[in-house]
């Protein structure tokens, strides 16, 4: 595991900075992927992980940034514009939309932090919100009032 | 506002510990809630947020722990055992299951950290994985081989 240097603030340092010495491993989604005969196809499998059995199936796309914590994030990408029929598992049903569920996740970006006299004092972590897509969900289309 | 003290390790300290001085705010999911006439009922709305328009609708339950970071997490709770019909939005279709999508989220627990001679040196953050349910997904039931 690689470590980011720890950073301890001198008294005058901005208290909004988040400071961390870090040892991290990527945390992929919980359920391990199983082989999927048509990994990118718009169909709902009868076995395999949840994202391939869903009638709004999706794949995960890795987003890696070594200056961000967590370094590895996964974005869901819908494989169908509409939901797949529960009956056949392959034909699309235009009465349902496959929509991404988003979440604003807290992440940290490392940047140099400086001591009292402007000297480089390791790295500090800057807190940001980062938009990730968690899954695809089969929804009824909005009816505008 | 007061802050947890930062904690910098002495040389011999275990490098698997994550150490942080932190200022955070709860980060709720992205889409604001809209009114839902039957907030706890098993139906798919034609308006409102994604979790109420889904044919596997869910609600969010707050999980707050003041010694954890983030302090506020939200767990999805499915409102139906099966998926709701796309046609009616209310009748359940036994051909589809409403299943929770889980994720192992990185969280931090605070605990006292100690200096070289066992003296109390503020708080350290211990990294853990914490299982959260993100959403409910309409899936085809597994066919056992």
């Amino acid at each position: 595991y690689s470590h980011w240097p720890s950073c301890c603030p001198s008294k005058g340092q901005d208290t909004s900075e988040e400071l961390l010495r870090w040892s991290t491993v990527p945390v992929p989604p919980l359920e391990p992927a199983r082989p999927n005969r048509h990994p990118e196809s718009c169909r709902a499998s009868e076995d395999g992980p949840l994202n391939s059995r869903a009638i709004s199936p999706w794949r995960y796309e890795l987003d890696r940034d070594l200056n961000r914590l967590p370094q590895d994030l996964y974005h869901a990408r819908c494989l169908c514009p509409h939901c797949v029929s529960l009956q056949t598992g392959s034909h699309m049903d235009p009465r349902g939309n496959s929509e991404l569920l988003y979440h604003n996740q807290t992440v940290f970006y490392r940047r140099p932090c400086h001591g009292e006299k402007g000297t480089h004092k390791g790295y500090c972590l800057e807190r940001r919100l980062y938009r990730v897509s968690l899954a695809c969900v089969c929804v009824r289309p909005r009816v505008m009032g | 506002y007061s802050h947890w003290p930062s904690c910098c390790p002495s040389k011999g300290q275990d490098t698997s510990e994550e150490l942080l001085r932190w200022s955070t705010v709860p980060v709720p999911p992205l889409e604001p809630a809209r009114p839902n006439r039957h907030p706890e009922s098993c139906r798919a709305s034609e308006d409102g947020p994604l979790n109420s328009r889904a044919i596997s609708p869910w609600r969010y339950e707050l999980d707050r722990d003041l010694n954890r970071l983030p302090q506020d997490l939200y767990h999805a709770r499915c409102l139906c055992p099966h998926c709701v019909s796309l046609q009616t939005g209310s009748h359940m279709d036994p051909r589809g299951n409403s299943e929770l999508l889980y994720h192992n989220q990185t969280v931090f627990y605070r605990r006292p950290c100690h200096g070289e001679k066992g003296t109390h040196k503020g708080y350290c953050l211990e990294r853990r994985l914490y299982r959260v349910s993100l959403a409910c997904v309409c899936v085809r039931p597994r066919v056992m081989g």
Epitope: - | Y1, S2, H3, W4, W22, S23, T24, V25, P26, P28, P29, E31, P32, A33, N36, P39, P49, N51, S52, R59, Y60, E61, L62, R64, L66, L69, Q71, D72, Y74, R110
Partner: antibody, heavy 121, light 107 residues
Amino acid sequence: EVQLVESGAEVKKPGASVKVSCKASGYSFSGYTMNWVRQAPGQRLEWMGLINPYNGGTSYNQNFKGRVTLTVDTSASTAYLELNSLRSEDTGVYYCAREDYDSWTFFAMDYWGQGTLVTVS
Amino acid sequence: DIQMTQSPSSLSASVGDRVTITCSASQGINEYLNWYQQKPGKVPKLLIYYTSSLHSGVPSRFSGSGSGTDFTLTISSLQPEDVATYYCQQYINFPYTFGQGTKLEIK
């Protein structure tokens, strides 16, 4: 100026339901959780639950045995408390209260509605 | 649930007196304690948060202290407008719980 304005007094029969509203103004409604607190005559304050308007996320006091439902209408900046299967001991003043917070240290009810008197008899 | 117990339940003091109200938690709550003031016929108001931090607009004669299970609200010099019932509240765990209140009157 932050304001929480609750609906008017209600008189209900035992077994009925009541729905109290709380209209917020003067701040970003979705940015703060809303608590509901009850005060029966001569009794201590009793926390009923809270709701995050951003996602409808809730936490309830289990002592109310599932009789409480909290909802919001973000477009109207309004929170709702519904209490069903009313009994005489539910008589009291019901308050909504905005919850402020700071990193790690506090969650506190900094603004309160004027209260809604619910009488069950 | 965490039980919060205040003492005394009521007290009478003179203007200018130093007044102390205590609050005891049935288990340790670190410093996760708030104090509220409710004047007769009025809505509760936040007085002190996180054991000792004064809410904005609250006079400096009010102070709070404590940690773990035992907490204190102190009014250094009682004023006539301080007539009220005072409640402590823990927020380390759901459900939030309040003390039974301390009714403060002027002699």
